[in-house]
């Protein structure tokens, strides 16, 4: 009498997440009488996958009718595969008894599940930084299998090199995640810049998946301040101008002080954008020279994006000869003017 063989013809089967997997198994003989069961894994910790006689296995169906007389095909189909289904599946023949006794196992079929990475999500720094400072961007993608994946960073199309990338877990797993950090040195011209995280994987039929972040969310470009006086008007009024240039973001408050006292406060809004994404703003203050006996110290105070105020001061000289006013002026800078 020929010894019973349990034949699992495929050493391995690959399937995409969401698809069905067919695991083939045939036996060489109908004798001895007894059931076939499918397990994932071997040894005492193995997991029962399918048993015709008992149990509820909603995702597993036999390929051929196991109740048919002389059936020797015990192949199964597992539907809606997920990465968690990966593993080695064994078709095992039992001899009928009380209890049934394990007789012979197939060689096993390794099921590998291929799953696409999720769309990369790029996150930037929590607080803005100024030019010449380094900021970090993080890119994450999850749920892919197999583990092999490539991730590249680009800034305005140029690949970044200051990058640290980890794929977890390090050992064998049903699916994997990737996390990468790129360090970017900011420049004043980066308001319109973009960083791209590009993920490539065997399952992707298109181009690599991309996640983006705009450096406008990470950068602060502090303003330049300049205070100038226009020539004296006939009515003894002096027009003093505070030019605030090349700043980003737009959130800016300007306060005029006359001899230390608040004269006027303005908030920037709906400003036109410069080509480089920064903003300019000009504020004017009319000073009636004849109303003052002494020199007038005017200060243009700018508070940008919640940062400490920057001042630029200007002295309007009051003289006994008003007609000479136009040239008798001086400007002074107080505080620090961030650049």
């Amino acid at each position: 009498e020929e010894e019973l063989q349990v034949i699992q013809p495929e050493k391995s089967v690959s399937v995409a997440a969401g698809d069905s997997a067919t695991l083939n198994c045939t036996v060489s003989s109908l004798i001895p009488v007894g059931p076939i069961q499918w397990f994932r894994g071997a040894g005492p910790g193995r997991e029962l996958i399918y048993n015709l006689k008992e149990g509820h296995f909603p995702r597993v169906t036999p390929v051929s009718d196991p109740t048919k007389r002389n059936n020797m095909d015990f192949s199964i189909r597992i539907s809606n595969i997920t990465p968690a289904d990966a593993g080695t599946y064994y078709c095992v023949k039992f001899r009928k008894g009380s209890p049934d006794v394990e007789l012979k196992s197939g060689a096993g079929t390794e099921l590998s599940v291929r799953a696409k990475p999720s769309a990369p999500v790029v996150s930037g720094p929590a607080v803005r930084a100024t030019a010449e400072h380094t900021v970090s961007f993080t890119c994450e993608s999850h749920g892919f299998s197999p583990r092999d994946i490539t991730l590249k960073w680009f800034k305005n199309g140029n690949e970044l090199s200051d990058v640290q990338t980890n794929v977890d877990p390090a050992g064998k797993s049903v699916s994997y995640s990737i996390r990468s950090t790129a360090r970017v040195v900011l420049t004043r011209r980066d308001v319109h810049s973009q960083v791209i995280c590009e993920v490539a994987h065997v399952t992707l039929q298109g181009d690599p998946l991309r996640g983006t972040a705009n450096l406008s969310e990470a950068i602060r470009v502090p303003p330049f301040l300049e205070v100038t006086q226009q020539s004296m008007r006939a009515d003894n009024q002096v027009n003093v101008t505070c030019q605030v240039t090349k700043f980003y973001p737009q959130r800016l408050q300007l306060t005029w002080l006359e001899n230390g006292n608040v004269s006027r406060t303005e908030m920037a809004s709906a400003l036109p954008e410069n080509k480089d994404g920064t903003y300019n703003w000009t504020s004017w203050l009319l000073v009636n020279v004849s109303a003052h006996r002494d020199d007038v110290k005017l200060t243009c105070q700018v508070e940008h994006d919640g940062q400490p105020a920057v001042n630029k001061s200007f002295s309007v000289k009051v003289s006994a000869h008003p007609k000479e006013q136009g040239s008798n002026t001086a400007a002074e800078n107080t505080g620090t003017n961030e650049r």
Epitope: S12, T150, H201
Partner: antibody, heavy 116, light 109 residues
């Protein structure tokens, strides 16, 4: 599901030649497609692929000698300036449904002979 | 580019016998290796992908194995219809490029 090449003929060196791969039973917008060639009595050689979104990628030796493009139903391989060394049977193929690491549907090939 | 070295270039075996073809990659290709069969004047036919996964409809007499840089195709119970040239093909996940081995001609006596 099938693919078939056309456009193979006798050509002269330096005269551009375009081969076409026509697919049926699946959409080019869902799969990566590749071009390969096989000189008489030689082995298979990879030329390049085009992604489902239409981006071409080439073998390092190509150096502008070929251009891959596609429409909704066909993929083209343009031989920009053929030489006699480009005489070969050209195959187009589709990658497998599980990933881009293998090709499971191949065309029968089309013969290009470049001769003076 | 990765170089694929396939050996032997030719092998002869009898019907019912076994043939082993080896393919070595210039660097690790992480099991991204496929095997094709090509008969004269015909298109290549996929046999195995991901080093050991049998393509649907291919007889289980064809077995693929290996990892890292070294891979093997074993054809057992040889049939006369197995006479063909066999090619290995790699995919490198970092460069995203493909390479073929030089081919092995299998002659069945």
């Amino acid at each position: 599901q099938s693919v078939e090449e056309s456009g193979g003929r006798l050509g002269t060196p330096g005269t551009p030649l375009t081969l076409t791969c026509t697919v049926s039973g699946f959409s080019l917008s869902s799969y990566v497609m590749g071009w390969f060639r096989q000189a008489p009595g030689k082995g298979l050689e990879y030329i390049g692929i085009i992604s489902s979104s239409g981006s071409p990628y080439y073998a390092s030796w190509v150096n502008g000698r070929f251009t891959i493009s596609k429409t909704s139903t066909t993929m083209d391989l343009k031989m920009n300036s053929p030489t006699t060394e480009d005489t070969a049977t050209y195959f187009c193929a589709r990658v497998g449904p599980l990933g881009v690491d293998y090709f499971n549907i191949w065309g029968p090939g089309t013969l290009v002979t470049v001769s003076l | 580019d990765i170089v694929m070295t396939q050996t032997p270039s030719s092998v002869e075996a009898a019907v019912g016998g076994t043939v082993t073809i080896k393919c070595q990659a210039g660097q690790s290709i992480n099991s991204y290796l496929a095997w094709y069969q090509q008969k004269p004047g015909q298109r290549p036919k996929l046999l195995i992908y991901y080093a050991s996964t049998l393509e649907s409809g291919v007889p289980s007499r064809f077995k693929g194995s290996g990892s890292g840089t070294d891979y093997t195709l074993t054809i057992s119970d040889l049939e006369s219809a197995d006479a063909a040239t066999y090619y290995c093909q790699s995919w490198h996940y970092i460069s995203r490029s493909y390479a073929f081995g030089g081919g092995t001609e299998v002659v069945v006596k």
